[in-house]
Interface confidence: medium
């Protein structure tokens, strides 16, 4: 019968021939009676047989991540007969796995959004990487995830390359943070390899700001002969959160003689002093009257960021008209 | 150190003209709106005019619309009052006065300078 | 125009004493648009109290505003040596009108 080991070859050789293993029969008694061949994909061209001796050589440098196991054939032939030996048997060689691969994020480029002052632990996104090296090899494929910029706000999961918040952070301040991640082979031990990926996080607005009075006091002045209605002029406070967070609404907070009114401009998000009564310049001709500034929606959780809300004083002038 | 000083004042016939500086100092001029004010035996403290942070806005009490005129200059850190045709009934001790942010009484005055019209 | 009067003309009181001055305006003061000062001989008047009750900064708590609409009422809980001098109240509801003042001065 046929007597053989499991054939291994490492890959990437560099040697012109390197000695895999040898194929005999048991009837062969080394006298160089029988004949050896070899069959098969890659048979001569890969890997070649001594006739004589059955030994088996690889003649060119292997890939395991192209090709990890190569099936030939064995024949043994009396050279006085020109008879088979042993029926031709089917073989396997094997080609084992060297650490020759980087670990390779193959879903980049990596892109995430995440509310701001999202509390430390938050999950922002999941990077995976992938090795081409055998995974049943030692740690050849086994990676280990770590964080080269993006501390102190983010931190990853070493094993899952789960990336989480580590730390607050305020839209207002920065609105998007480039993490950047290393996937290393070899569990992180001498010859690894390593990979990176860069990780676009970008801050979503929360409500965490009040609008606040650009000015402590508006000067204004109104013409006696003003109708109720008139717009007198407009005050402005300004909002460092975007979008429907930064939608505010005025109104009066104290005006004793209630002669005015304050309406909002949603659009440009101006208040706008409304003469709600007539003045008279012999009654009175100047006012003070104090105006408040909130945000439209402010979510319940968010109430902490919006207690007291900014106030200021416009003074009115009233202009005298020449009365007939 | 914050404060207002008035100059200018003195002895002048009456129809005559005068005019009061006042310099400030220490405080951020030209965010406040500032005011004449004077002060007679006969009838105390009278407002006179006042002037927006910016002059944008000038208004005077009736009994010197048309004569006095009320000026800044914020680069100066200087405000200003031009008397003209001036009467003995404007006799007084003039100061200026610095309005607060939130209303209009005065937080901070000067020491005033006298302003005798006398034939 | 708002008038202020003021009573007493003057008030005549020991160091240590509690002092009241009045300042009634001829019609309603908008918002409590009232303030009172302090004028020493020689010296510009000092802002004590605005909006009838507020006491301005550096104020001693001695010394207290109140009421609206058009009575008025200035307060010095003891008085001291400093506090001799003439006080004025001044409406700025509407336009500016000043009191014509309440002398305190040492019995």
């Known amino acids: 019968g046929w007597v053989w080991n499991q054939f291994f070859v490492p890959e990437e050789m560099n040697t012109t021939s390197h000695h895999i293993g040898q194929l005999r029969s048991d009837l062969d008694n080394g006298n160089n009676s029988f004949q050896y061949k070899l069959l098969g994909a890659g048979a001569g061209s890969t890997f070649i047989i001594d006739e004589r001796t059955g030994d088996i050589y690889a003649i060119q440098k292997l890939d395991r991540e192209e090709r990890s196991l190569y099936i030939l054939r064995a024949q043994v032939i009396d050279i006085a007969t020109g008879r088979a030996v042993e029926p031709e048997s089917e073989f396997v060689i094997k080609v084992s796995d060297i650490n020759d691969n980087e670990p390779k994020f193959l879903d980049e480029p990596y892109e995430a959004i995440v509310p701001e002052m999202s509390p430390e632990g938050t999950l922002v996104i999941q990077v995976t990487a992938s090795d081409a090296d055998d995974p049943s090899s030692g740690n050849n494929a086994r990676l280990l995830y770590s964080l080269l910029q993006g501390q102190p706000y983010f931190s990853v999961e070493p094993t899952t390359g789960v990336i989480r918040i580590s730390s607050k952070m305020d839209r207002e301040l920065q609105d998007e943070y480039w993490v950047i991640i290393q996937a290393k082979d070899m569990i992180g031990q001498p010859g690894a390899l390593s990979g990176t990926t860069s990780v676009l996080i970008k801050l979503s607005d929360v409500n965490d700001n009040k609008p606040i009075f650009k000015e402590s006091l508006y000067r204004l002045t109104v013409s006696e002969s003003a109708p109720t209605g008139t717009s007198i002029g407009t005050i402005m406070a300004y909002d460092n959160d975007i979008g429907e967070n930064a939608e505010m609404d005025y109104s009066i907070e104290e005006d004793d003689s209630q002669t005015f009114d304050i309406i909002t401009n949603h659009e440009t998000q101006e208040g706008i002093v409304i003469l709600k009564k007539k003045v008279d310049f012999e009654h009175q001709n100047h006012y003070g009257i104090r105006a408040k500034v909130k945000n439209h929606h402010v979510p319940e959780q968010l109430m902490k960021y919006h207690t007291e809300a900014s106030t200021t004083f416009i003074k009115i002038q009233v202009e005298d008209v020449d009365e007939p | 150190q914050v404060q207002l000083v008035e100059s200018g004042g003195g002895v002048v016939q009456p129809g005559r003209s005068l005019r009061l500086s006042c310099a400030a100092s220490g405080f951020s001029f030209s965010s406040y709106d500032m005011d004449w004010v004077r002060q007679t035996p006969g009838k105390g403290l009278e407002w006179v005019a006042v002037?927006?942070?910016?002059?944008?806005?000038?208004y005077y009490a009736d009994s010197v619309r048309g004569r006095f005129t009320i000026s800044r200059d914020n680069s100066k850190n200087t405000l200003f009052l031009q008397m003209n045709s001036l009467r003995v009934e404007d006799t007084a001790v003039y100061y200026c006065a610095r309005e607060t942010g939130e209303g209009w009484y005065f937080d901070l005055w000067g020491r005033g300078t006298l302003v005798t019209v006398s034939s | 125009e708002i008038v202020l009067t003021q009573s007493p003309g003057t008030l005549s009181l020991s160091p240590g004493e509690r002092a009241t001055l009045s300042c009634r305006a001829s019609?309603?003061?908008?918002?409590?648009?009232l303030a009172w000062y302090q004028q020493k001989p020689g010296q510009a008047p000092r802002l004590l109290i605005y909006?009838?009750?507020s006491r301005a900064t550096g104020i001693p708590d001695r010394f207290s505003g109140s009421g609206s609409g058009t009575d008025f009422t200035l307060t010095i809980s003891r008085l001291e040596p400093e506090d001799f001098a003439v006080y004025y109240c001044?409406?700025?509801?509407?336009?500016?009108?000043f009191g014509q003042g309440t002398k305190v001065e040492i019995k």
């Open positions: 019609q309603s003061v908008s918002s409590s648009y």
């Open positions: 002037i927006w942070y910016d002059g944008s806005n000038k």
């Open positions: 909006g009838a009750s």
């Open positions: 001044q409406q700025y509801g509407s336009s500016w009108t």
